[in-house]
Interface confidence: low
């Protein structure tokens, strides 16, 4: 991969349908402990290692060339819980138009095995520059993986790698409104391998979700559901062992 990842490119909204402009913390990372390609708990876990590895300090090689990673991130080894109080961020009520998610993350499930299907609450919904990171391992002989970003009973963004659809591997994206699925968007590039670890990163942009797998840009999916702040849950399901699921702001 080229060494041209920058925050500016990731957020500039260029018309490139297959942009390589992920933030510095996304791309071209050396493999870290635990065998996650690209980095060991990068992105949403600045300064924090996988369970049992490098306690209290950053894993080796994380964030080369990405100074500061995520400003305002917690000190090494610290895993803050989400703010108390009802509803969204900040805890005084629903998020304001600006600063709804100050970059103080990550929030989400602590690192460690998680039960699948798993629901990651997104208490204030999603907002542009929000980065969701999911780490796990595909089970042997896997059939499917699914991420469902949900607004009430609607599925705003369904990301569904299928390992054997008519003897082909394909990623299907869609939206479900009023129990009706819309037009499918299909992607034949398939970066998942049965039995192997993976990292999925979803970057929320004003007009679309941008998805990278193992530090390589995969696809983008235009928003079909308005009111992003009400997409308040991420469902993770399928044939995976889930290690962690979290989000932060970049």
């Amino acid at each position: 991969m080229a060494d041209n990842f920058s925050l500016h490119d990731a957020l500039s909204g260029s018309g490139n349908p297959n942009p390589q402009g992920w933030p510095g913390a996304w791309g071209n990372q050396p493999a870290g402990a635990g065998g996650y390609p690209g980095a060991s708990y990068p992105g949403a876990y600045p300064g924090q290692a996988p369970p049992g590895a490098y306690p209290g300090q950053a894993p080796p090689g994380a964030y080369p060339g990405a100074p500061g990673a995520y400003p305002g991130a917690p000190a090494p080894g610290v895993y803050p819980g989400p703010p108390s109080g009802p509803g969204a961020y900040p805890s005084s009520g629903q998020p304001s138009a600006t600063g709804a998610y100050p970059a103080t993350g990550p929030y989400g499930a602590p690192a460690g095995p998680l039960i699948v299907p798993y629901n990651l609450p997104l208490p204030g919904g999603v907002v542009p520059r929000m980065l969701i990171t999911i780490l796990g391992t595909v089970k042997p002989n896997a059939n499917r993986i699914a991420l469902d970003f949900q607004r009430g009973n609607d599925v705003a963004f369904h990301f569904n790698p299928r390992f054997n659809e008519n003897n082909r591997r394909v990623i299907v994206c869609n939206t479900k409104l009023d129990n009706n699925w819309g037009r499918e968007e299909r992607q034949s590039v398939f970066p998942f391998e049965s039995g192997k670890p993976f990292k999925i990163q979803v970057l929320v942009e004003p007009d679309h979700f941008k998805v990278a797998v193992n530090d390589a840009h995969l696809l983008q999916y235009n928003h079909r559901v308005k009111k992003l702040n009400e997409i308040s849950k991420l469902g993770i399901s399928g044939d995976i062992d889930l290690t962690s699921a979290s989000y932060t702001m970049i």
Epitope: Q94, A97, D178, K227, E230
Partner: antibody, heavy 116, light 109 residues
């Protein structure tokens, strides 16, 4: 097709409370947010807030917190707005609106008059 | 709270193209504001025209279109009809609340 039918006009005394209903037909009631909007002559349209019957989620305009409360009865596909401590400032037409990806479906409105 | 501003009144002729705009006091209107356009006709009859900046509602004539023009949301009626005479409200979404504009009274003479 999608239809929203609100309850009839209300004449209330200051200090009283009122509950306005909005019956939905033609779609899955629990899946869509219901917005509530207030219209007063000379004041245009004001968003009171919204309510998702499926899980009880709600958002309120700060101005109407303590004044309005949203509820629903999913067995009858009916949404409600409960207005308390009524004053003449609450005299208005109140609308329920089904929020959708590409459009809003508006009910016919309920006229509330608060007068002693 | 943000203030949303519309032209108070516009006049057009049948067959002409007219554009109504919607400005936000907080800066440029973006797709994240999910601009909605609603038509009000006499007797409190409201019809949703456009949602999510540029998505035309089912059954709404193709002459109605939504867009962003410069730093504002816009509703364009291409080939106005006499039945388009109405008040048009825009509404902008601000992270967790909706704000309506004051409405534009469109006269089609």
């Amino acid at each position: 097709q999608v239809q929203l039918q609100q309850s009839g006009a209300e004449l209330m005394k200051p200090g009283a409370s009122v509950k306005i209903s909005c019956k939905a037909t033609g779609y899955t009631f629990t899946n869509y947010w219901i917005e509530w909007v207030k219209q007063r002559p000379g004041h245009g349209l004001e968003w009171i807030g919204e309510f998702l019957p499926g899980d009880g989620s709600s958002h309120y305009n700060e101005k109407f917190k303590g004044k309005a409360t949203f509820t629903s009865d999913t067995s009858s596909n009916t949404a409600y707005i409960h207005l308390t401590s009524l004053t003449s400032e609450d005299s208005a037409v109140y609308y329920c609106v089904r929020d959708d990806y590409d459009s809003d479906y508006w009910a016919q409105g309920t006229t509330l008059t608060v007068s002693s | 709270q943000a203030v949303v501003t519309q032209e108070s009144a516009l006049t057009t002729s049948p067959g002409e193209t007219v554009t109504l705009t919607c400005r936000s006091s907080t800066g440029a209107v973006t797709t994240s504001n999910y601009a909605n356009w609603v038509q009000e006709k006499p007797d409190h009859l409201f019809t949703g025209l456009i949602g999510g900046t540029n998505n035309r509602a089912p059954g709404v004539p193709a002459r109605f279109s939504g867009s962003l023009i410069g730093d504002k949301a816009a509703l364009t009626i291409t080939g106005a009809q006499t039945e388009d005479e109405a008040i048009y409200f825009c509404a902008l979404w601000y992270s967790n609340h909706l704000v309506f504009g004051g409405g534009t009274k469109l006269t089609v003479l």
